[in-house]
């Protein structure tokens, strides 16, 4: 089958890193600078991605593979193949359209990216709060009160009151 295909289509013989040049009687020509072909039999080479500005080159473009980018310090990759670079925030913050904002009371973010998430509700698992949550850290749930003092009520103490004007997101 391969032999039959190559007799019918001379372009199928062109390996990765080359293209089938219609202007030169369909001979295999090397990809020009700043371009690549990752598969054989291509009639054109693809333009290499340029990792410029906020992007940094993680892997140079070659005749057979595209460049790969990551982000300059202070930014992190988003999307397939690091298609975008998003600004880092501090732990305890999230990125909004207005920039980095502190997590609202009752929420936390332990990373430089992503959104603030609500503290774990220990009482849902019948447990109590062992360590209070912060903007940067989730609460730590401990054994239920019943486990700590046999015969005692198993009601979890109420969660701390919310700050006025703040609610978890």
């Amino acid at each position: 089958f391969e032999r039959t295909r190559s007799l019918q289509d001379p372009c199928s013989n062109c390996p990765a890193g080359t293209f089938c040049d219609n202007n030169r009687n369909q001979i295999c020509s090397p990809c020009p600078p700043n371009s690549f072909s990752s598969a054989g039999g291509q009639r054109t080479c693809d333009i290499c991605r340029q990792c410029k500005g906020v992007f940094r080159t993680r892997k140079e473009c070659s005749s057979t593979s595209n460049a790969e980018c990551d982000c300059t310090p202070g930014f992190h990759c988003l999307g397939a193949g690091c298609s975008m670079c998003e600004q880092d925030c501090k732990q305890g913050q999230e990125l909004t359209k207005k920039g980095c904002k502190d997590c609202c009371f009752g929420t936390f973010n332990d990373q430089k990216r992503g959104i603030c998430r609500p503290w774990t509700n220990c009482s849902l698992d019948g447990k109590s709060v062992l360590v209070n949550g912060t903007k940067e850290r989730d609460v730590v749930c401990g054994p239920s009160p019943a486990d700590l003092s046999p015969g005692a009520s198993s009601v979890t103490p109420p969660a701390p009151a919310r700050e006025p004007g703040h609610s978890p997101q």
Epitope: P32, N34, I47, R49, Q50, K52, G53, V54, F55, T72, G74, F75, S83, M84, C85, E86, Q87, G99
Partner: antibody
């Protein structure tokens, strides 16, 4: 399709700050670089600086001490401030959208003329 | 004084082929791709060629670009009167971490 529109005062006094805004319509500001380019009367195009949608900036070294570019993604706008202007800053100012993976300016605003004069 | 060097003017008669050159250095054209912009009087520049030789949709195939080493060129075949405009080359400069332009070539159709 995406359109850019520059706005701001057409006349600025020497030593004052030139302030221009570029409004992006018909598309998102995310994922692109956004540049300011200027062209003095009868002269060459000069790159002033760019901002990436997430806040990364870079400026032409010859103007760096006087330039600030900022972005407001909630309004789909980005802005230029050029301080301590002189007559040499008189030019047509263009805002552009720059492709972030192959770096070319595929969308240009119509341009706004700024004259520096007392 | 522009980083990329272009001839200030070029001319040709209708139907002719005209080439505009653009010379740079290893930090720009030598290591990055070249773009070309067309500008008519009183209007904003328009992207004509990107990534050395790619045409945006709507640009006639009479326009072609090429690059070799630290130089690039724009070729216009079958010259037409409506091609009379200023043509700018541009590209990324690694030492600047930003784009650089040529000072433009004024094309006159005789």
């Amino acid at each position: 399709q995406v359109q850019l529109q520059e706005s701001g005062p057409g006349l600025v006094k020497p030593s004052e700050t030139l302030s221009l805004t570029c409004t992006v319509s018909g598309g998102s500001i995310s994922g692109y670089y956004w540049s300011w380019i200027r062209q003095p009367p009868g002269k060459c195009l000069e790159w002033i600086g760019y901002i990436y949608y997430s806040g990364f900036t870079n400026y032409n070294p010859s103007l760096k001490s006087r330039v600030t570019i900022s972005v407001d993604t909630s309004k789909n706008q980005f802005s230029l401030k050029l301080s301590s202007v002189t007559a040499a800053d008189t030019a047509v100012y263009y805002c552009t959208r720059d492709h972030s993976h192959y770096y070319y300016m595929d969308v240009w605003g119509q341009g706004t003329t700024v004259t520096v004069s007392s | 004084q522009s980083v990329l060097t272009q001839p200030p003017s070029a001319s040709g008669t209708p139907g002719q082929r005209v080439t505009i050159s653009c010379s740079g250095s290893s930090s720009n054209i030598g290591s990055n791709t070249v773009n070309w912009y067309q500008q008519f009087p009183g209007t904003a520049p328009k992207l004509l060629i990107y990534s050395n030789n790619q045409r945006p949709s709507g640009v006639p195939d009479r326009f072609s670009g090429s690059k070799s080493g630290t130089s690039a060129s724009l070729a216009i075949s079958g010259l037409q009167s409506e091609d009379e405009a200023d043509y700018y080359c541009a590209g990324w400069d690694d030492s600047l971490n930003g784009p650089v332009f040529g000072c433009g070539t004024k094309l006159t159709v005789l």
